[in-house]
């Protein structure tokens, strides 16, 4: 039985040209995290594999930085970066947990961080 939950930074906003940290945290499970994928809609941004380290998609390598931790830092933000981001945790023996973050990139300086909140986890077994 999968008992874990994914906590994310929730709905966040940032200024155009600035940076933002995408962060998820898996709790309430003793499962071992083997890999975390970061995706924007259906597009892969990065993979952090426990044994192999990071893979940053070549399309994003000039403005995506690994970390902190299993998180991801997006730099040189544009309004086109507005949208949904997903952290997909591959774990053993539980399976897959998915968290969602919504990022809004604003033209002005009114960007504020949303409060942290828990997203119900989606999971599937293989």
């Amino acid at each position: 039985m999968m008992t874990g939950t994914i906590e994310t930074t929730g709905n966040i906003s940032a200024e155009k040209g600035g940076s933002i940290i995408l962060q998820c945290h898996l709790s309430s499970t003793t499962a071992q995290v083997t890999q975390v994928n970061w995706e924007q809609q259906d597009q892969l941004l990065a993979i952090c594999n426990a044994d192999l380290g990071w893979h940053i998609s070549p399309s994003f390598k000039d403005r995506v930085a690994p970390g902190p931790g299993l998180g991801l830092t997006l730099q040189s933000l544009t309004v086109n970066d507005t949208g949904e981001y997903f952290c997909i945790y591959h774990t053993y023996p539980d399976g897959t947990y998915t968290g969602r973050i919504f990022l809004e990139v604003l033209e002005s300086s009114v960007a504020e961080h949303g409060a942290r909140f828990q997203i119900p986890h989606h999971h599937h077994h293989h």
């Epitope: 083997t34 892969l44 044994d51 893979h55 998609s57 070549p58």
Partner: antibody
Framework: EVQLVQSGAEVKKPGASVKVSCKAS????????MHWVRQAPGQGLEWMGR????????KYNEKFKSRVTITVDKLSSTAYMELSSLRSEDTAVYYC????????????WGQGTTVTVSS | DIVMTQSPDSLAVSLGERATINCRVS??????LAWYQQKPGQSPKLLVY???TLAEGVPDRFSGSGSGTDFTLTISSLQAEDVAVYYC?????????FGPGTKVDIK
């Protein structure tokens, strides 16, 4: 056109070291990780390690960790694989291979470099 | 280490017929599996990654399927140029490992 051009064949004595080069062209060298894979005569493929040309950070197969060093020269868009303390079982074709867009597989391969270890 | 096994070791198929190669993995690798083709005297060539995504420029007679621990590469209509050794590889952990290969010939 993506090209990975490797250095020529080498013959080495047991105990020596070999350094194989892989010159990349046709893409932005620092945007793609590079892998090294070897193939002994008539045998299958064996992964040795990978490197991020941008940061220089590398990961190795534990089997080779004490003997292999993977490096890059960003200026010349060249990756290198050095294997030390050679033995006859290291006789193989050594390939560099560019990591793909979506993970840790390899989408383009060099032509291979034959390394023969013989006394 | 993750152990990869392939079956059969070799197969001979008539031109235009279907060829099926299986790859079994010792543990769950989700869909992180690639297939490569290696012709005699040549470097490996990527055919499929993420179990079912065809690499750029690969003819659509090739297809991949499976997830978890069991995967299949299918050549729907074998052509003379498909004679080669085919390798599966997981791309999920260290070390990356390959199957022993399956040799495909014309019957």
């Amino acid at each position: 056109e993506v090209q990975l051009v490797q250095s020529g064949a080498e013959v080495k004595k047991p105990g020596a070291s070999v350094k194989v080069s892989c010159k990349a062209s046709g893409y932005t060298f620092t945007n793609y990780y590079m892998h090294w894979v070897r193939q002994a005569p008539g045998q299958g493929l064996e992964w040795m390690g990978r490197i991020d040309p941008d940061s220089g950070g590398s990961k190795y197969n534990e089997k080779f960790k004490s003997r292999v060093t993977i490096t890059v020269d960003k200026l010349s868009s060249t990756a290198y694989m050095e294997l030390s303390s050679l033995r006859s079982e290291d006789t193989a074709v050594y390939y560099c291979a560019r990591e793909g867009h979506y993970g840790f597989y390899s989408d383009y391969w060099g032509q291979g470099t034959t390394v023969t270890v013989s006394s | 280490d993750i152990v990869m096994t392939q079956s059969p070791d070799s197969l001979a198929v008539s031109l235009g017929e279907r060829a099926t190669i299986n790859c079994r993995v010792s543990e769950n690798i989700y869909s992180y599996l690639a297939w490569y083709q290696q012709k005699p005297g040549q470097s490996p060539k990527l055919l499929v990654y993420n179990a079912k995504t065809l690499a750029e420029g690969v003819p659509d007679r090739f297809s991949g399927s499976g997830s978890g621990t069991d995967f299949t590469l299918t050549i729907s209509s074998l052509q003379a140029e498909d004679v080669a050794v085919y390798y599966c590889q997981h791309h999920y952990g260290n070390p990356l490992t390959f199957g022993p290969g399956t040799k495909v010939d014309i019957k």
